[in-house]
């Protein structure tokens, strides 16, 4: 057992059918030592009495709020929730596996520059009696400081039957620079609560590797006189870090016929305008890439040739 | 990356090109690795990122753009003269690098030489025969000392008497390897910014 | 104590469908995940499916993906294994499991797929 | 397909020391623990070992189990008649958890 915050304490049990548990004893929180009570939660059954109470912890019935009473007095209150070890390995029961980019991947994050400034979400199916806390460091034997604001649902989604929600949170790395060559990982850990079962989930990258920038800005197209070629032009993103010249990106350039069973001409290039040809009907598209090393693509900016 | 590119002529900056060659080849190096030693471990999550410069040469600090000079996190071990000697940069305007930005980037890559092809000989006795590293990648790093032009002085190959432990030798290799990458992108930035200025 | 006593094997032809059943006693049955295991004649044990305490999520083993349901019920306190388009190979004694680091097995039922 | 790789088998004399080997790879037993079950002829599985050493009750002390990187061993010391069975190690990988991946089984003879 261990105290997850004031008042709150996790139990970690090995999670199988008729499983022995494991005891816990509870202090009352008083400088009382007599004619004190127990309770569970909005029971008024009496568990037991005296300044301490022993119970056998098995089972999500046998979580929950205790509370220490003195003549209809509340003295302290200590919240049991329960860890699930299931066959060795800690239950991922209120999270869902985002299988990207590989399976197991609970916590997802992003990056738009160099700047140690981050995003992680997660998705889940709950709706209700959830809670999460975030924290970071770089590096785990001595932690440099992350500072992470609080996780907020950002966005809810219809899969099939069930509703989906998506919830994110911001961190920023206390004293990042830009140029540095990370050698310790930024560490992710989420503790998630769902009514009376407590869970954790980590994550852990190089900023250089999360990295996705914005889609290029300004996307303009000038059409080239007496020719179907056009001068596409754009700029890179805002959030991208700068100096442009340090921290270069390339580009791709797609030309994609209104149907998506057309070929699509690809370019690539490190300038920040290339010529191709517009089809009718036709759209063309841009995204960008850390030039020197290849994390992830930025979403597409896109203009039609018309 | 693999993708078709139309790069731009590097123009009056020779390291430019050198430098795009190294990190193309030591990319390549490294998934290769990844691939041939798939039993072992030699991606990034598994490996110990170890930096054979550390304490010895100061890239990142020295070759640091201005722009940066402001932002406190990176001003840790600045040295603050500005360099004079140096073929890469021919006639082109210098003020705007630290003193020991290229001088740095040579020792890099003397150092890196030096551990690759100590690291060679040793995987030229394995029976396994498993692992070789790539003369491209080797020669990519001599080319670009040669554009350097520095002189400094040549560090002895390191020989050993004992029988080489293969296995840890190849997860040395992807250890180097990674962090060669992670310099070999610094130093392409740098020469990008030089050749900009 | 924990029990769990399995039912609907038998002998089927090749293509046709066969559910399996295993009914558990003696615990919280809808807080536990629960396996499919099965073992061919004179070979080894290969896992089939598992599904988690509250039937929300279902994982397969490649050689049934498709072709095999796993389900429970937890008010009856029962676990199924819908079996289609049955092949020749899937002959064998199929075990219902509990998860966990202690586990609890069926007896076993044949499922025999012959023409 | 069988990830973990046992002898198909092994045999000894009653009082002997009989060892299998279980060996697999980083994802599986260098990244989760190992079980061991003994399988009589016509029985369901039986559960000896779990979490790589730990003896569930009831399970006789002459059997050890242990892990080391990507190996896992099961030892039986002072074999008995009573113990010829077939062995199978189990592990999971951690890709595809919570599928089960067993080992490919090791029949235990005990010899005179």
């Known amino acids: 057992i261990w105290e997850l915050k004031k008042d709150v304490y996790v139990v970690e049990l090995d999670w199988y059918p008729d499983a022995p548990g494991e005891m816990v004893v509870l202090t009352c929180d008083t400088p009382e030592e007599d004619g004190i009570t127990w309770t569970l939660d909005q029971s008024s059954e009496v568990l037991g009495s005296g300044k301490t109470l022993t119970i056998q912890v098995k089972e999500f019935g046998d979580a929950g709020q205790y509370t220490c009473h003195k003549g209809g007095e509340v003295l302290s209150h200590s919240l049991l929730l329960l860890h699930k070890k299931e066959d060795g390995i800690w239950s991922t029961d209120i999270l869902k596996d985002q299988k990207e980019p590989k399976n197991k991947t609970f916590l997802r994050c992003e990056a738009k520059n160099y700047s140690g400034r981050f995003t992680c979400w997660w998705l889940t199916t709950i709706s209700t009696d959830l809670t999460f806390s975030v924290k970071s460091s770089r590096g785990s034997s001595d932690p440099q400081g992350v500072t992470c604001g609080a996780a907020t649902l950002s966005a809810e989604r219809v899969r099939g039957d069930n509703k989906e929600y998506e919830y994110s949170v911001e961190c920023q790395e206390d004293s990042a620079c830009p140029a540095a060559e990370e050698s310790l990982p930024i560490e992710v850990m989420v503790d998630a609560v769902h009514k009376l079962k407590y869970e954790n989930y980590t994550s852990s990258f190089f900023i250089r590797d999360i990295i996705k920038p914005d889609p290029p800005k300004n996307l303009q197209l000038k059409p080239l006189k007496n020719s179907r070629q056009v001068e596409v032009s754009w700029e890179y993103p805002d959030t991208w870090s700068t100096p442009h010249s340090y921290f270069s990106l390339t580009f791709c350039v797609q030309v994609q016929g209104k149907s998506k069973r057309e070929k699509k001409d690809r370019v690539f290039t490190d300038k920040t305008s290339a010529t191709v040809i517009c089809r009718k009907n036709a759209s063309i598209s841009v995204r960008a890439q850390d030039r020197y090393y290849s994390s992830s693509w930025s979403e597409w900016a896109s203009v039609p040739c018309s | 990356r693999n993708l078709p590119v139309a790069t731009p002529d590097p123009g009056m900056f020779p390291c430019l090109h050198h430098s795009q060659n190294l990190l193309r080849a030591v990319s390549n190096m490294l998934q290769k690795a990844r691939q041939t030693l798939e039993f072992y471990p030699c991606t990034s999550e598994e490996i110990d990122h170890e930096d054979i410069t550390k304490d010895k040469t100061s890239t990142v600090e020295a070759c640091l753009p201005l722009e940066l000079t402001k932002n406190e996190s990176c001003l840790n071990s600045r040295e603050t003269s500005f360099i004079t000697n140096g073929s890469c940069l021919a006639s082109r305007k210098t003020s705007f690098m630290m003193a020991l930005c290229l001088s740095s980037i040579y020792e890099d890559l003397k150092m890196y030489q030096v551990e690759f092809k100590t690291m060679n000989a040793k995987l030229l006795m394995d029976p396994k025969r498993q692992i070789f590293l790539d003369q491209n990648m080797l020669a990519v790093i001599d080319e670009l000392m040669q554009a350097l032009n520095f002189n400094s002085e040549t560090v002895p190959q390191k020989s050993s008497l004992e029988e080489p432990d293969f296995y840890k030798t190849k997860i040395k290799l992807c250890i180097l390897l990674h962090a060669f990458r992670i310099r070999a992108v610094t130093i392409d930035r740098v020469m990008s910014y030089l050749n900009a200025s | 104590q924990v029990q769990l006593v399995q039912s609907g094997g038998g002998v089927v032809q090749p293509g046709r469908s066969l559910r399996l059943s295993c009914a558990a006693s003696?615990?919280?049955?809808?807080?536990?995940?629960m396996h499919w295991v099965r073992q061919a004649p004179g070979k080894g044990l290969e896992w089939v499916a598992f599904i988690r305490y509250d039937g929300s999520n279902k994982y397969y083993a490649d050689s049934v993906k498709g072709r095999f349901t796993i389900s429970r019920d937890n008010s009856k306190n029962t676990l199924y294994l819908q079996m289609k388009s049955l092949r020749a190979e899937d002959t064998a004694v199929y075990y219902c499991?509990?998860?966990?680091?202690?586990?609890?097995w069926g007896q076993g039922t044949m499922v025999t797929v012959s023409s | 397909s069988y990830v973990l790789t046992q002898p198909p088998s092994v045999s000894g004399t009653p009082g002997q020391r009989v060892t299998i080997s279980c060996s697999g790879g980083?994802?599986?037993?260098?990244?989760?623990?190992v079980k061991w079950y003994q399988q009589l002829p016509g029985t369901a599985p039986k559960l000896l070992i779990y979490e790589n050493d730990q003896r569930p009750s009831g399970v006789p002390d002459r059997f050890s189990g242990s892990k080391s990187g990507t190996s896992a061993s099961l030892a039986i010391t002072g074999v008995q008649a009573e113990d010829e069975a077939d062995y199978y190690c189990?592990?999971?990988?951690?890709?595809?958890?919570?599928?089960?991946?067993f080992g490919t089984g090791t029949k235990v003879t005990v010899l005179g």
């Open positions: 980083r994802s599986n037993i260098g990244s989760n623990t």
């Open positions: 499991k509990t998860h966990g680091s202690h586990d609890n």
């Open positions: 003696g615990f919280t049955f809808s807080s536990y995940g």
């Open positions: 189990q592990s999971y990988d951690r890709g595809t958890h919570p599928a089960l991946l």
